[in-house]
Protein backbone atom coordinates (compact mmCIF):
# COMPACT_ATOMS: atom_id res chain seq x y z
CA UNK A 1 0.00 0.00 0.00
CA UNK A 2 1.40 3.56 -0.75
CA UNK A 3 2.24 5.97 2.18
CA UNK A 4 3.58 8.74 2.69
CA UNK A 5 6.44 9.77 5.20
CA UNK A 6 7.80 13.38 6.79
CA UNK A 7 11.14 13.70 7.23
CA UNK A 8 11.00 15.38 9.95
CA UNK A 9 7.63 15.20 10.63
CA UNK A 10 7.80 18.52 12.63
CA UNK A 11 9.38 21.45 10.34
CA UNK A 12 11.57 24.22 12.05
CA UNK A 13 10.47 27.39 9.70
CA UNK A 14 13.02 28.11 7.24
CA UNK A 15 14.59 25.04 6.95
CA UNK A 16 13.51 22.07 4.48
CA UNK A 17 11.14 18.77 4.80
CA UNK A 18 11.31 15.74 2.63
CA UNK A 19 8.11 13.91 1.25
CA UNK A 20 8.93 10.52 0.85
CA UNK A 21 6.84 7.60 -1.00
CA UNK A 22 7.15 4.11 0.16
CA UNK A 23 5.77 1.42 -1.76
CA UNK A 24 5.66 2.29 -4.90
CA UNK A 25 3.28 0.94 -7.46
CA UNK A 26 5.71 -1.04 -10.20
CA UNK A 27 3.39 0.06 -13.50
CA UNK A 28 3.65 3.91 -12.58
CA UNK A 29 4.38 5.91 -15.25
CA UNK A 30 4.20 9.29 -13.78
CA UNK A 31 3.37 11.16 -10.43
CA UNK A 32 1.18 14.18 -9.18
CA UNK A 33 1.68 16.22 -5.50
CA UNK A 34 -0.98 18.40 -4.61
CA UNK A 35 -1.55 19.93 -1.01
CA UNK A 36 -3.97 19.03 0.74
CA UNK A 37 -6.15 15.74 1.11
CA UNK A 38 -7.68 15.41 -2.36
CA UNK A 39 -6.52 15.67 -5.46
CA UNK A 40 -7.82 18.64 -7.56
CA UNK A 41 -6.60 20.25 -10.41
CA UNK A 42 -6.18 23.62 -8.81
CA UNK A 43 -4.35 22.42 -5.60
CA UNK A 44 -1.56 20.98 -7.88
CA UNK A 45 2.18 21.71 -6.86
CA UNK A 46 3.83 19.36 -9.62
CA UNK A 47 3.49 16.42 -11.96
CA UNK A 48 6.20 14.17 -13.39
CA UNK A 49 6.35 12.19 -16.26
CA UNK A 50 8.92 9.09 -15.50
CA UNK A 51 9.52 8.34 -19.01
CA UNK A 52 10.52 12.00 -20.09
CA UNK A 53 11.57 13.30 -16.50
CA UNK A 54 9.74 15.99 -17.14
CA UNK A 55 8.00 18.06 -14.29
CA UNK A 56 5.55 20.35 -14.63
CA UNK A 57 4.45 23.20 -12.19
CA UNK A 58 1.07 23.84 -11.24
CA UNK A 59 -1.13 26.31 -9.53
CA UNK A 60 0.01 25.69 -6.01
CA UNK A 61 3.46 25.48 -7.13
CA UNK A 62 5.58 27.94 -5.05
CA UNK A 63 8.75 27.72 -6.67
CA UNK A 64 10.72 25.96 -3.43
CA UNK A 65 9.40 22.19 -4.54
CA UNK A 66 11.20 19.66 -6.05
CA UNK A 67 10.08 16.34 -7.22
CA UNK A 68 12.33 13.42 -7.21
CA UNK A 69 11.83 10.43 -10.36
CA UNK A 70 11.19 8.31 -6.71
CA UNK A 71 7.91 10.61 -5.94
CA UNK A 72 9.90 12.22 -3.29
CA UNK A 73 8.72 15.49 -2.85
CA UNK A 74 11.25 18.11 -1.32
CA UNK A 75 10.06 21.62 0.13
CA UNK A 76 12.76 24.23 1.30
CA UNK A 77 12.75 27.73 3.18
CA UNK A 78 8.86 26.45 4.57
CA UNK A 79 6.80 28.84 5.86
CA UNK A 80 3.98 28.23 8.38
CA UNK A 81 1.79 28.12 5.61
CA UNK A 82 3.41 25.25 4.53
CA UNK A 83 1.97 23.34 7.32
CA UNK A 84 -0.69 20.70 6.79
CA UNK A 85 -1.58 17.57 4.03
CA UNK A 86 0.20 16.67 0.87
CA UNK A 87 -1.51 14.10 -1.70
CA UNK A 88 0.49 11.91 -4.16
CA UNK A 89 -1.35 10.43 -7.16
CA UNK A 90 0.71 7.45 -8.78
CA UNK A 91 -0.40 7.34 -12.65
CA UNK A 92 -0.36 3.91 -13.39
CA UNK A 93 0.04 2.40 -16.98
CA UNK A 94 -3.78 0.64 -16.13
CA UNK A 95 -4.64 4.42 -15.06
CA UNK A 96 -5.82 2.94 -12.53
CA UNK A 97 -4.32 5.62 -10.19
CA UNK A 98 -3.05 5.34 -6.25
CA UNK A 99 -2.78 8.32 -4.11
CA UNK A 100 -1.44 8.51 -0.48
CA UNK A 101 -1.84 11.82 2.01
CA UNK A 102 0.99 12.60 4.26
CA UNK A 103 1.58 15.66 6.38
CA UNK A 104 3.85 17.64 8.48
CA UNK A 105 3.86 20.64 10.65
CA UNK A 106 6.03 23.76 10.62
CA UNK A 107 7.03 25.40 14.12
CA UNK A 108 8.43 29.63 14.36
CA UNK A 109 11.53 29.58 14.62
CA UNK A 110 12.51 30.55 17.83
CA UNK A 111 14.05 33.38 19.06
CA UNK A 112 17.39 33.37 21.71
CA UNK A 113 15.91 33.29 24.85
CA UNK A 114 17.28 36.28 26.99
CA UNK A 115 16.94 36.20 31.03
CA UNK A 116 15.84 39.16 32.87
CA UNK A 117 16.21 39.13 36.94
CA UNK A 118 14.56 41.55 39.98
CA UNK A 119 17.94 40.92 41.79
CA UNK A 120 21.45 39.18 40.69
CA UNK A 121 22.63 39.88 44.11
CA UNK A 122 20.35 38.91 46.81
CA UNK A 123 21.36 38.04 50.73
CA UNK A 124 20.75 34.72 51.75
CA UNK A 125 17.91 33.93 54.11
CA UNK A 126 16.17 37.42 53.18
CA UNK A 127 15.37 38.12 49.47
CA UNK A 128 13.71 36.04 46.53
CA UNK A 129 14.82 36.30 43.23
CA UNK A 130 12.61 36.22 40.07
CA UNK A 131 14.02 34.91 37.03
CA UNK A 132 11.71 35.56 33.55
CA UNK A 133 12.37 34.05 30.46
CA UNK A 134 11.91 36.53 27.68
CA UNK A 135 10.14 36.72 24.80
CA UNK A 136 6.83 34.90 25.90
CA UNK A 137 6.33 32.39 22.41
CA UNK A 138 3.08 30.63 22.30
CA UNK A 139 2.73 26.96 22.60
CA UNK A 140 6.07 26.62 23.14
CA UNK A 141 7.50 25.11 26.39
CA UNK A 142 9.96 26.80 28.89
CA UNK A 143 13.08 24.71 30.58
CA UNK A 144 15.89 26.04 32.92
CA UNK A 145 18.96 25.13 34.13
CA UNK A 146 21.34 25.60 36.75
CA UNK A 147 25.14 25.34 36.19
CA UNK A 148 24.37 22.86 33.19
CA UNK A 149 21.75 20.91 35.46
CA UNK A 150 18.31 20.50 34.91
CA UNK A 151 16.16 22.31 38.08
CA UNK A 152 16.17 20.47 41.16
CA UNK A 153 13.63 19.50 43.29
CA UNK A 154 13.21 22.00 45.85
CA UNK A 155 10.52 23.74 47.89
CA UNK A 156 12.13 26.94 47.68
CA UNK A 157 11.92 26.80 43.88
CA UNK A 158 8.85 28.03 41.83
CA UNK A 159 8.07 27.90 38.25
CA UNK A 160 4.71 29.79 37.18
CA UNK A 161 3.68 31.51 34.23
CA UNK A 162 3.50 28.71 32.04
CA UNK A 163 7.44 28.28 33.34
CA UNK A 164 7.99 31.57 31.84
CA UNK A 165 9.33 32.76 35.51
CA UNK A 166 11.52 30.46 38.00
CA UNK A 167 11.09 32.35 41.63
CA UNK A 168 14.13 31.15 44.13
CA UNK A 169 12.24 31.99 47.93
CA UNK A 170 14.60 32.76 50.21
CA UNK A 171 17.96 32.46 48.30
CA UNK A 172 20.38 29.78 50.17
CA UNK A 173 24.27 30.30 49.56
CA UNK A 174 24.10 26.82 47.49
CA UNK A 175 21.58 28.70 45.03
CA UNK A 176 24.97 30.71 43.65
CA UNK A 177 25.44 29.83 39.96
CA UNK A 178 24.77 29.76 36.73
CA UNK A 179 21.33 30.27 35.30
CA UNK A 180 19.82 29.48 31.32
CA UNK A 181 16.45 29.00 29.80
CA UNK A 182 15.49 27.22 27.09
CA UNK A 183 12.61 27.65 24.90
CA UNK A 184 11.53 24.25 22.93
CA UNK A 185 9.06 23.31 20.50
CA UNK A 186 8.77 20.05 18.48
CA UNK A 187 10.70 21.50 15.78
CA UNK A 188 13.64 23.35 17.86
CA UNK A 189 15.31 24.82 20.74
CA UNK A 190 17.13 27.45 21.99
CA UNK A 191 19.21 28.26 25.13
CA UNK A 192 19.74 31.85 26.84
CA UNK A 193 23.21 32.79 27.82
CA UNK A 194 23.76 32.47 31.53
CA UNK A 195 23.30 34.42 33.81
CA UNK A 196 25.50 34.69 37.46
CA UNK A 197 23.24 34.80 40.80
CA UNK A 198 25.69 35.93 43.34
CA UNK A 199 24.27 34.97 46.62
CA UNK A 200 25.76 37.32 49.37
CA UNK A 201 26.06 35.84 52.68
CA UNK A 202 27.70 35.39 56.25
CA UNK A 203 29.59 36.29 57.58
CA UNK A 204 29.08 33.01 59.61
CA UNK A 205 30.23 32.84 63.64
CA UNK A 206 33.85 33.09 62.87
CA UNK A 207 36.52 30.30 64.05
CA UNK A 208 40.18 31.80 65.28
CA UNK A 209 42.72 28.98 64.48
CA UNK A 210 45.06 27.14 65.75
CA UNK A 211 42.13 25.68 67.51
CA UNK A 212 43.70 24.67 70.87
CA UNK A 213 43.10 20.96 71.63
CA UNK A 214 42.95 20.13 74.53
CA UNK A 215 41.32 23.35 76.40
CA UNK A 216 44.91 23.33 78.76
CA UNK A 217 47.15 23.44 75.73
CA UNK A 218 49.87 25.84 77.35
CA UNK A 219 50.92 29.39 76.07
CA UNK A 220 54.01 29.58 77.60
CA UNK A 221 55.67 33.37 77.92
CA UNK A 222 58.23 33.84 75.30
CA UNK A 223 56.22 32.38 72.59
CA UNK A 224 54.92 34.11 69.35
CA UNK A 225 51.02 34.15 69.39
CA UNK A 226 49.62 33.80 66.14
CA UNK A 227 46.35 33.92 65.39
CA UNK A 228 44.14 33.45 62.48
CA UNK A 229 40.15 33.99 62.13
CA UNK A 230 38.16 32.93 59.63
CA UNK A 231 34.56 33.25 58.39
CA UNK A 232 32.76 32.40 55.57
CA UNK A 233 31.13 35.36 53.63
CA UNK A 234 30.43 36.75 50.13
CA UNK A 235 31.76 39.03 49.62
CA UNK A 236 34.87 38.22 52.07
CA UNK A 237 34.18 40.32 55.35
CA UNK A 238 36.30 43.02 56.87
CA UNK A 239 38.18 41.57 59.64
CA UNK A 240 39.07 43.68 62.84
CA UNK A 241 40.88 42.84 66.15
CA UNK A 242 40.39 43.26 69.65
CA UNK A 243 42.41 43.06 73.02
CA UNK A 244 40.55 43.41 76.31
CA UNK A 245 38.00 45.48 74.36
CA UNK A 246 40.90 47.88 72.96
CA UNK A 247 40.69 48.00 68.49
CA UNK A 248 43.50 46.01 67.02
CA UNK A 249 44.77 45.79 63.29
CA UNK A 250 42.05 44.91 60.62
CA UNK A 251 44.16 41.77 59.54
CA UNK A 252 42.92 37.95 58.91
CA UNK A 253 45.73 37.46 61.22
CA UNK A 254 46.58 38.63 64.47
CA UNK A 255 50.58 38.15 65.26
CA UNK A 256 52.25 39.05 68.86
CA UNK A 257 55.74 38.19 69.22
CA UNK A 258 57.02 36.69 72.13
CA UNK A 259 54.19 36.92 74.79
CA UNK A 260 54.44 37.52 78.27
CA UNK A 261 51.73 37.04 81.28
CA UNK A 262 50.97 41.23 79.93
CA UNK A 263 49.28 38.99 77.27
CA UNK A 264 46.71 37.40 79.61
CA UNK A 265 43.08 38.48 78.45
CA UNK A 266 40.47 38.30 75.67
CA UNK A 267 41.06 38.56 72.36
CA UNK A 268 38.01 38.71 69.65
CA UNK A 269 37.66 39.11 65.89
CA UNK A 270 35.28 40.78 64.34
CA UNK A 271 33.72 40.35 61.24
CA UNK A 272 32.07 42.47 58.89
CA UNK A 273 29.57 42.24 55.74
CA UNK A 274 28.51 45.83 54.52
CA UNK A 275 26.37 43.74 51.29
CA UNK A 276 24.67 42.02 53.76
CA UNK A 277 24.48 44.39 56.96
CA UNK A 278 25.37 41.50 58.91
CA UNK A 279 28.61 41.29 61.49
CA UNK A 280 29.77 38.38 63.58
CA UNK A 281 32.65 38.09 66.47
CA UNK A 282 34.39 35.34 68.52
CA UNK A 283 35.96 36.33 71.74
CA UNK A 284 38.67 33.73 73.17
CA UNK A 285 40.36 34.31 76.66
CA UNK A 286 44.50 33.42 76.17
CA UNK A 287 45.99 32.63 79.69
CA UNK A 288 50.09 32.93 79.13
CA UNK A 289 51.97 31.44 81.93
CA UNK A 290 55.68 32.12 83.22
CA UNK A 291 58.19 28.99 81.77
CA UNK A 292 56.87 26.17 83.82
CA UNK A 293 53.65 26.21 84.36
CA UNK A 294 50.90 25.23 81.74
CA UNK A 295 47.44 27.20 81.67
CA UNK A 296 46.33 28.08 77.68
CA UNK A 297 43.87 29.09 75.81
CA UNK A 298 40.37 29.10 77.33
CA UNK A 299 38.13 26.45 76.57
CA UNK A 300 34.98 28.62 77.25
CA UNK A 301 35.42 30.60 73.59
CA UNK A 302 31.94 32.61 73.35
CA UNK A 303 31.17 34.02 69.43
CA UNK A 304 28.42 36.91 69.31
CA UNK A 305 25.79 37.20 66.25
CA UNK A 306 24.55 40.58 64.90
CA UNK A 307 22.20 41.53 62.52
CA UNK B 1 55.31 54.04 62.43
CA UNK B 2 54.45 52.42 59.29
CA UNK B 3 56.22 53.55 56.50
CA UNK B 4 56.73 52.78 52.54
CA UNK B 5 59.86 53.78 50.99
CA UNK B 6 60.25 53.85 47.38
CA UNK B 7 62.96 54.11 45.22
CA UNK B 8 64.28 57.17 43.13
CA UNK B 9 63.14 58.23 40.16
CA UNK B 10 63.88 56.49 36.93
CA UNK B 11 64.58 58.12 33.46
CA UNK B 12 63.93 54.91 30.83
CA UNK B 13 64.23 54.92 27.11
CA UNK B 14 60.77 53.41 25.17
CA UNK B 15 60.99 49.89 25.18
CA UNK B 16 62.93 49.02 28.07
CA UNK B 17 61.92 48.00 31.32
CA UNK B 18 62.44 49.47 34.93
CA UNK B 19 61.88 47.97 38.37
CA UNK B 20 61.02 49.91 41.25
CA UNK B 21 61.30 49.05 45.11
CA UNK B 22 58.58 50.07 47.86
CA UNK B 23 60.46 48.60 51.46
CA UNK B 24 57.97 48.26 54.23
CA UNK B 25 58.68 49.37 57.98
CA UNK B 26 56.82 49.75 61.61
CA UNK B 27 54.16 47.26 60.78
CA UNK B 28 54.66 43.36 60.00
CA UNK B 29 55.02 42.98 56.12
CA UNK B 30 53.16 39.47 55.40
CA UNK B 31 49.84 40.56 57.23
CA UNK B 32 48.81 43.65 54.87
CA UNK B 33 48.58 43.06 51.32
CA UNK B 34 50.34 46.14 49.17
CA UNK B 35 48.80 47.96 46.12
CA UNK B 36 50.24 49.95 43.19
CA UNK B 37 48.65 53.11 41.89
CA UNK B 38 49.81 55.23 38.90
CA UNK B 39 48.88 58.80 38.56
CA UNK B 40 50.03 60.63 35.22
CA UNK B 41 50.79 64.20 35.60
CA UNK B 42 47.85 66.57 36.43
CA UNK B 43 45.45 62.64 36.29
CA UNK B 44 43.75 61.11 38.49
CA UNK B 45 44.56 57.63 39.90
CA UNK B 46 44.50 54.74 38.41
CA UNK B 47 45.02 50.82 40.41
CA UNK B 48 47.80 48.16 38.93
CA UNK B 49 47.18 45.81 41.05
CA UNK B 50 48.09 43.86 44.69
CA UNK B 51 50.80 41.31 46.11
CA UNK B 52 49.70 39.30 48.80
CA UNK B 53 53.83 39.28 50.45
CA UNK B 54 53.08 36.02 52.20
CA UNK B 55 51.57 34.15 49.97
CA UNK B 56 53.10 35.91 46.36
CA UNK B 57 49.12 36.02 45.15
CA UNK B 58 48.96 38.75 42.50
CA UNK B 59 45.95 40.28 41.07
CA UNK B 60 46.23 42.81 38.49
CA UNK B 61 43.88 45.07 36.80
CA UNK B 62 43.31 43.86 32.99
CA UNK B 63 44.82 47.05 31.53
CA UNK B 64 48.42 46.17 33.63
CA UNK B 65 48.40 42.18 33.27
CA UNK B 66 50.80 42.94 30.48
CA UNK B 67 52.60 45.73 31.92
CA UNK B 68 53.24 45.28 35.45
CA UNK B 69 55.20 42.06 37.25
CA UNK B 70 54.63 42.49 41.26
CA UNK B 71 56.53 40.74 43.74
CA UNK B 72 58.17 40.95 47.15
CA UNK B 73 60.73 40.04 49.22
CA UNK B 74 59.67 38.71 52.72
CA UNK B 75 63.56 38.91 54.08
CA UNK B 76 63.79 42.40 53.22
CA UNK B 77 59.90 43.60 53.83
CA UNK B 78 60.44 44.84 50.10
CA UNK B 79 57.90 44.73 47.53
CA UNK B 80 59.23 45.77 43.44
CA UNK B 81 57.15 46.37 40.55
CA UNK B 82 58.88 46.23 36.89
CA UNK B 83 57.36 47.88 34.04
CA UNK B 84 58.21 46.47 30.66
CA UNK B 85 58.05 47.60 27.04
CA UNK B 86 57.97 50.94 28.35
CA UNK B 87 55.96 54.28 26.27
CA UNK B 88 55.63 57.54 26.77
CA UNK B 89 52.06 56.72 28.17
CA UNK B 90 54.08 54.80 30.71
CA UNK B 91 55.88 58.45 32.27
CA UNK B 92 53.55 58.89 35.74
CA UNK B 93 54.25 58.55 39.61
CA UNK B 94 54.13 55.06 40.47
CA UNK B 95 52.70 54.56 44.25
CA UNK B 96 52.57 51.84 46.83
CA UNK B 97 50.45 51.49 49.14
CA UNK B 98 49.09 49.44 52.21
CA UNK B 99 45.86 47.66 52.35
CA UNK B 100 44.28 49.25 55.58
CA UNK B 101 43.06 45.47 56.09
CA UNK B 102 42.36 42.32 54.56
CA UNK B 103 39.47 42.07 51.93
CA UNK B 104 37.08 45.19 50.57
CA UNK B 105 39.76 47.69 52.96
CA UNK B 106 41.23 50.64 51.73
CA UNK B 107 44.68 52.06 50.98
CA UNK B 108 45.57 53.64 54.10
CA UNK B 109 49.69 54.14 54.17
CA UNK B 110 50.65 55.22 51.19
CA UNK B 111 54.33 55.49 49.84
CA UNK B 112 56.31 58.72 48.26
CA UNK B 113 56.03 57.62 44.87
CA UNK B 114 58.34 57.14 42.16
CA UNK B 115 58.70 59.47 39.21
CA UNK B 116 59.17 57.54 35.81
CA UNK B 117 60.22 59.48 32.85
CA UNK B 118 60.59 57.72 29.43
CA UNK B 119 62.16 58.99 26.50
CA UNK B 120 62.56 57.58 22.89
CA UNK C 1 34.38 46.74 35.89
CA UNK C 2 32.91 49.09 38.58
CA UNK C 3 33.14 53.02 37.02
CA UNK C 4 32.84 55.70 39.64
CA UNK C 5 31.70 59.19 38.60
CA UNK C 6 32.47 62.42 40.76
CA UNK C 7 31.03 65.32 40.16
CA UNK C 8 32.04 68.25 40.30
CA UNK C 9 35.69 67.96 38.55
CA UNK C 10 36.46 71.54 40.21
CA UNK C 11 35.21 73.77 43.07
CA UNK C 12 35.96 77.02 44.23
CA UNK C 13 35.34 78.17 48.04
CA UNK C 14 36.13 80.22 50.61
CA UNK C 15 37.68 79.10 54.18
CA UNK C 16 34.80 78.77 56.72
CA UNK C 17 32.30 77.81 53.57
CA UNK C 18 30.62 73.70 53.25
CA UNK C 19 31.30 72.15 50.29
CA UNK C 20 30.15 68.56 49.13
CA UNK C 21 31.54 66.15 47.06
CA UNK C 22 29.80 63.71 45.20
CA UNK C 23 30.41 60.13 44.13
CA UNK C 24 28.48 57.92 42.05
CA UNK C 25 28.89 53.85 41.52
CA UNK C 26 28.04 52.32 38.21
CA UNK C 27 26.81 49.76 40.08
CA UNK C 28 25.48 48.74 44.02
CA UNK C 29 28.94 48.90 46.10
CA UNK C 30 26.96 48.98 49.45
CA UNK C 31 29.24 50.64 51.65
CA UNK C 32 32.60 49.99 49.89
CA UNK C 33 33.27 53.54 49.59
CA UNK C 34 36.82 55.56 50.43
CA UNK C 35 38.23 59.10 50.42
CA UNK C 36 40.94 60.17 49.89
CA UNK C 37 42.74 64.11 50.21
CA UNK C 38 45.62 64.95 47.88
CA UNK C 39 47.47 67.44 48.03
CA UNK C 40 50.36 69.16 45.31
CA UNK C 41 52.83 66.97 45.01
CA UNK C 42 52.53 64.66 47.73
CA UNK C 43 51.03 60.97 48.04
CA UNK C 44 47.06 60.62 48.61
CA UNK C 45 45.76 60.28 52.05
CA UNK C 46 42.78 58.01 53.91
CA UNK C 47 39.88 60.16 54.73
CA UNK C 48 36.97 58.12 55.46
CA UNK C 49 36.19 54.41 54.37
CA UNK C 50 32.95 52.05 54.45
CA UNK C 51 31.54 55.21 52.95
CA UNK C 52 31.16 56.94 56.56
CA UNK C 53 33.94 55.73 59.37
CA UNK C 54 36.35 58.68 59.91
CA UNK C 55 39.89 57.22 60.12
CA UNK C 56 41.75 58.64 63.15
CA UNK C 57 43.46 61.68 63.52
CA UNK C 58 41.07 63.08 60.64
CA UNK C 59 39.37 66.29 61.77
CA UNK C 60 35.67 65.56 62.54
CA UNK C 61 34.71 68.68 59.97
CA UNK C 62 35.28 65.88 57.23
CA UNK C 63 32.08 62.94 56.97
CA UNK C 64 30.91 60.58 54.60
CA UNK C 65 27.60 59.39 53.75
CA UNK C 66 25.81 57.28 51.85
CA UNK C 67 24.94 53.82 50.15
CA UNK C 68 24.44 51.67 46.89
CA UNK C 69 25.24 53.64 44.37
CA UNK C 70 25.31 57.51 45.94
CA UNK C 71 27.81 59.13 48.35
CA UNK C 72 29.16 62.33 49.37
CA UNK C 73 32.30 63.31 50.93
CA UNK C 74 30.99 66.79 53.70
CA UNK C 75 33.50 69.18 54.70
CA UNK C 76 32.27 71.68 56.40
CA UNK C 77 33.66 75.31 57.63
CA UNK C 78 36.85 74.95 55.40
CA UNK C 79 40.21 75.75 56.79
CA UNK C 80 43.45 76.42 54.56
CA UNK C 81 45.02 73.03 54.86
CA UNK C 82 41.85 71.20 53.23
CA UNK C 83 42.77 72.47 49.73
CA UNK C 84 43.74 70.17 47.14
CA UNK C 85 42.32 67.36 45.39
CA UNK C 86 39.85 64.45 46.81
CA UNK C 87 39.10 61.27 45.17
CA UNK C 88 36.90 58.42 45.97
CA UNK C 89 37.54 54.62 45.47
CA UNK C 90 35.32 51.97 46.01
CA UNK C 91 36.95 48.80 47.43
CA UNK C 92 34.29 46.23 46.88
CA UNK C 93 36.75 43.38 45.49
CA UNK C 94 38.76 44.06 42.57
CA UNK C 95 39.51 46.06 40.51
CA UNK C 96 39.71 48.82 43.00
CA UNK C 97 38.48 52.18 40.68
CA UNK C 98 38.72 55.55 41.86
CA UNK C 99 36.43 58.71 40.42
CA UNK C 100 38.05 61.40 37.75
CA UNK C 101 38.60 63.72 41.76
CA UNK C 102 37.54 66.89 42.37
CA UNK C 103 40.23 69.76 42.44
CA UNK C 104 38.87 71.88 45.61
CA UNK C 105 40.62 75.54 45.01
CA UNK C 106 40.80 78.73 47.35
CA UNK C 107 38.06 81.54 46.10
Known amino acids: KLTIESTPFNVAEGKEVLLLAHNLPQNRIGYSWYKGERVDGNSLIVGYVIGTQQATPGPAYSGRETIYPNASLLIQNVTQNDTGFYTLQVIKSDLVNEEATGQFHVYPELPKPSISSNNSNPVEDKDAVAFTCEPEVQNTTYLWWVNGQSLPVSPRLQLSNGNMTLTLLSVKRNDAGSYECEIQNPASANRSDPVTLNVLYGPDVPTISPIISPPDSSYLSGANLNLSCHSASNPSPQYSWRINGIPQQHTQVLFIAKITPNNNGTYACFVSNLATGRNNSIVKSITVSASGTSPGLSAGAHHHHHH | QVQLQQSGAELAKSGASVKMSCKASGYIFTSYWLHWVKQRPGQGLEWIGY????????NYSQKFKDKATLTADKSSSTAYMQLSSLTSEDSAVYYC?????????????WGQGTSVTVSS | DIQMTQSPASLSASVGETVTITCRAS??????LAWYQQKQGKSPQLLVFNAKNLVEGVPSRFSGSGSGTQFSLKINSLQPEDFGSYYC?????????FGGGTKLEIK
Open chain 2, 97 to 109: AREYGNYNYPLDY
Open chain 3, 89 to 97: QHHYGTPYT
Open chain 2, 51 to 58: INPNTGYT
Open chain 3, 27 to 32: ENIYGY
